[in-house]
């Protein structure tokens, strides 16, 4: 089948990194500089993606594969193939049209991207708030008040996180 197809269509023999050149009796010409073809049998090459501005090159373009971009520090990728770079914010903030804004009371964001989300409503699960929420952290729900009646085993809250490399005082 391959041989038959090749006899019918000389372009099918052109490998990735080349194109079937109409100007040269359909011989396989290398893709011009700064272009690529990722599959065989193509009549055209495509222009390599340019990673410029807030984009930086993660992988250089080759004759057989497009360049891949990521974002410069302070920005993060959005969209398929990092089609956009969006500004980072601090934890406890979200990006608005006017820039980074602190999360409103009752909401939090524990990442440098995305939106502020409401704290968990512990009472919906019949639980109580064990650790209050902040702009950066969700509340921690504990056992329901009924579970803390005399005789019930109490829950020890987790010890506060310490800086790595520091031993307890």
């Amino acid at each position: 089948f391959e041989r038959t197809r090749s006899l019918q269509d000389p372009c099918s023999n052109c490998p990735a990194g080349t194109f079937c050149d109409n100007n040269r009796n359909q011989i396989c010409s290398p893709c011009p500089p700064n272009s690529f073809s990722s599959a065989g049998g193509q009549r055209t090459c495509d222009i390599c993606r340019q990673c410029k501005g807030v984009f930086r090159t993660r992988k250089e373009c080759s004759s057989t594969s497009n360049a891949e971009c990521d974002c410069t520090p302070g920005f993060h990728c959005l969209g398929a193939g990092c089609s956009m770079c969006e500004q980072d914010c601090k934890q406890g903030q979200e990006l608005t049209k006017k820039g980074c804004k602190d999360c409103c009371f009752g909401t939090f964001n524990d990442q440098k991207r995305g939106i502020c989300r409401p704290w968990t409503n512990c009472s919906l699960d019949g639980k109580s708030v064990l650790v209050n929420g902040t702009k950066e952290r969700d509340v921690v729900c504990g056992p329901s008040p009924a579970d803390l009646s005399p005789g019930a085993s109490s829950v020890t809250p987790p010890a506060p996180a310490r800086e790595p490399g520091h031993s307890p005082q």
């Epitope: 194109f19 079937c20 050149d21 109409n22 100007n23 010409s29 893709c31 011009p32 700064n34 193509q42 009549r43 055209t44 090459c45 495509d46 222009i47 340019q50």
Partner: antibody, heavy 118, light 108 residues
Framework: EVQLLESGGGLVQPGESLRLSCKAF????????INWVRQAPGKCLEWVGY????????TFNDKFKDRFTLSVDKSKSTAYLQMNSLRAEDTAVYYC???????????WGQGTLVTVSS | NIQMTQSPSSLSASVGDRVTITCRAS??????LAWYQQKPGKAPKLLIY???TRATGVPSRFSGSGSGTDFTLTISSLQPEDFATYYC??????????FGCGTKLEIK
Amino acid sequence: EVQLLESGGGLVQPGESLRLSCKAFGYTFTNHHINWVRQAPGKCLEWVGYINPYNDYTTFNDKFKDRFTLSVDKSKSTAYLQMNSLRAEDTAVYYCARTWGHWYFDLWGQGTLVTVSS
Amino acid sequence: NIQMTQSPSSLSASVGDRVTITCRASQSVSSNLAWYQQKPGKAPKLLIYDSSTRATGVPSRFSGSGSGTDFTLTISSLQPEDFATYYCQQYNNWPPWTFGCGTKLEIK
């Protein structure tokens, strides 16, 4: 006959959108890129961008990539230029033009006039 | 972006004259340069590509030369149908591909 035929031009108000079409005849549509080139009154020719109908890959002039998008309908051998948030300075004749492995334009449509005015 | 500068911007000549139009690139474009002819109300038509290769069906009186930054289009003996505007275009460097702003060839 090998040709490209544009349509969809007309008068629109600033801020509005418009979609131009470019229908290919007489050749294998997926073998060539479709480019869009515009010519404002008394101005130079200006390349907008291209789409490869074979794989839907697009590349734009940076000047246009935020407001313009390119697409194709292979079953209709037709390419589209979607223009959003149009401005008075987008007033021009818009041509579709064909390229392939080399980046000169070997076939042009007849052009369609887009006028942006209030 | 690479700037393409054409000179002269307009030119008057007579049928039978030899005419030369120049195009200069702001940086080298190797031999990746095309010339187009455009008549009023019509689309541009490819004349020359790769600096010196005539497109299919283009009369032999049209010729192109040059490489790097300096290019010329020559019409050896003007015919009445040659009065039009001529554009150069570079396709060497990253998009955007850029055009000269044209040379209008008028009848003297």
